[in-house]
Amino acid sequence: KSPVFGPQEVSSVEGNSVSIKCYYPPTSVNRHTRKYWCRKGASGRCITLVSSEGYVSSNYAGRANLTNFPENGTFVVNIAQLSRDDSGHYKCGLGINSRGLSFDVSLEVSQGPELPNGTEVYTVDVGRTVTIKCPFKTENAPKTKALYKKIGQTSVLVIDSRNYVNPNYKDRIRLRIPGTGQLIFTVVIDRLRLSDHGLYLCQAGDGSNRDEKNADLQVLEPEPELVYEDLRGSVTFHCALGLEVANVAKFLCRVNSRETCDVVINTLGKRDSAFEGRILLNPQDKDGSFSVVITGLRKEDEGRYLCGAHSDGQLQEGWPIQAWQLFVNEESTIPRSPTVVKGVAGGSVAVLCPYNPKESQSLKYWCLWEGAQNGRCPLLVESQGLVQEQYEGRLSLLQEPGNGTFTVILNQLTTQDAGFYWCLTNGDTRWRTTVEIKIIEGEPNLKVPGNVTAVLGETLNIPCHFPCKFSSYEKYWCKWSNTGCQTLPSQDEGPSEAFVNCDENSRLVSLTLNPVTRADEGWYWCGVKQGHFYGETAAVYVAVEEKKVAGSRYVSPAKADAAPDEKVLDSGVREIENKAIQDPRLFAEEKVVADTGDQAGGSRASVDSSSSEEQGGSSK
């Protein structure tokens, strides 16, 4: 007995589509082997029509596809524009057509219901608008026009030109009679309901001279579009509901087990807490279309999603909807990375951001998720080097470690930095990820002075204390600019054995600027790293002033005043929106941090690493 299972019988009507789901045991071999849909011929051979390897027969070109969902042990064969010639016996299977793992499916395509001669067929999705055209002769121009719905043997009046409107169609139907010379009237029905489905009769005049025209209205619930995304990745639902609802509140909801639809997000400010920090409803275009981005996908995000429009911001019968079935693939190509990163006030965090390794040249970005209204994500930093002004000196995006991961470092942390941040690129949008920064109790591990004033032409020495736990790490000083943090040349630090016996409470690595020049003014970072993986950093601002007294200046390691709080984000910052997601260069322009000039270079700047005998304080 074959372990493949599906529908034994599928019946449909001409012009329709079918979506045949075949289930298989999701073993490793089954998940990755070829899937096929073939038609059994008189000879007993089964001729492939479509397969998971991309083959589509000429008979199916442009109207069929096969999608494998390995995670679920399911593959789906979609066939559109059915004709009666498609009736027959088929097999869905795994591997080779002639062997083993397959299931027999009988497909029957019928002509559909017999309709009166000359019946016009209107096929419209639920919630949309239909315009039924009703021709008439000149002699019936002055006479009553009406639309009836046929229910069984009776005809029920829906609307007429004497201002009658059936209560079932109240506020969503209108009859239009054109000016003289045009021998056609139209009936427009908005916000179609499933119950509107059926046969209608247009009538102009009465008695034996009346004009009649039949209309068959087919109201369909939209077939959900299959969406298959990776765990930890991102999905975008593009929702185009039409101009009729351009000014109506929009929503995305998820169908629950009670067959109702729970709002995930809407334009009235409602948002499901399960999506906090990882959802944006992008502003709608003039045509009323909008999109919803969800990042950090979880297995429990799977399900059927509907987007729609209604003044209440939630699903109501008879309003337009679009549907998706989201599957989340646990065999994800997106690597695991921490979803929560913790830092202490005054300290730092180094966030690893994954990107599609095939797109190493893509521009990298980091933005701050803001929950107000529909959510937005103003860009804070990008790989081209632009940094939001209020993050000057404390934020940097590094291409390291590379090969599918970049690093974002944020230091001088305050409680206001707690929140959700998104990693993204201008390439593969499915690789957007979310990280939450939490500020916890504690002291920074690296200790540097507060703000430092250096004297032009003299020597400046800045100490950076680190605890013993960092003794095996590489230490560095770098000069921050809006294009990154340029590592400063270090002096020979002596043999690494110096760090093996770590008895002292802390050690220090010093930065020496000799002589100090105007170009040395700016932010300097002391940091630790292991290979291409960055650890903690501490920042110090060096101001340069004219010479007042002679001699070298040594800055004591005592903690100086913290830098003042950053400015609040202004409303003009760029943010992710529909177009910009595809190409973040389309964001509105904004003020950027001016480049801080030449990097300190040559032998003027040096880094010295030694023990700090004179410093007795301990560091957590």
Partner: nanobody
Framework: EVQLVESGGGLVQSGGSLRLSCAAS????????VGWFRQAPGKEREFVTA??????????YYADSVKGRFTISRDNARNTVDLQMNSLKPEDSAVYYC?????????????????WGQGTLVTVSS
């Protein structure tokens, strides 16, 4: 929420026929799945058949043990799903349950149905 009520169970001789009905009340859908399951005393519940519809397309699923003997159908006017059981055997004796689900994707043989009926007893005597 959809409520489901089974009817039509009873005692029948081996080789005989029986027609079970599953009536749905509450909201009805253009896309829905109704499955029939059965549970004999001391045994696990097992899948019998299911019907899934989407607009004017219908998909019918049968367990190997009932294929060719049982037929599942949908009566739009009465809002019911009927199970015609022919050539009944003593091993078909069980409590028959109907179940409904919104999902168009999950395996109809599975147990992730959203609503279940109370069941109707079918006894086939030899």
């Amino acid at each position: 929420e959809v409520q489901l009520v089974e009817s039509g169970g009873g005692l029948v001789q081996s080789g005989g026929s029986l027609r079970l009905s599953c009536a749905a009340s509450g909201r009805t859908f253009d896309q829905f799945t109704v499955g029939w399951f059965r549970q004999a005393p001391g045994k696990e519940r097992e899948f019998v058949t299911a019907i899934r519809w989407s607009g004017s397309t219908t998909y019918r699923y049968y367990a190997d043990s009932v294929k060719g003997r049982f037929t599942i159908s949908r009566d739009n006017a009465r809002n019911t799903v009927d199970l015609q059981m022919n050539s009944l055997k003593p091993e078909d004796s069980a409590v028959y349950y109907c179940a409904g689900q919104m999902s168009q994707w999950s395996d109809p043989r599975g147990d992730d149905y959203d609503s279940w009926g109370q069941g109707t007893l079918v006894t086939v005597s030899s």
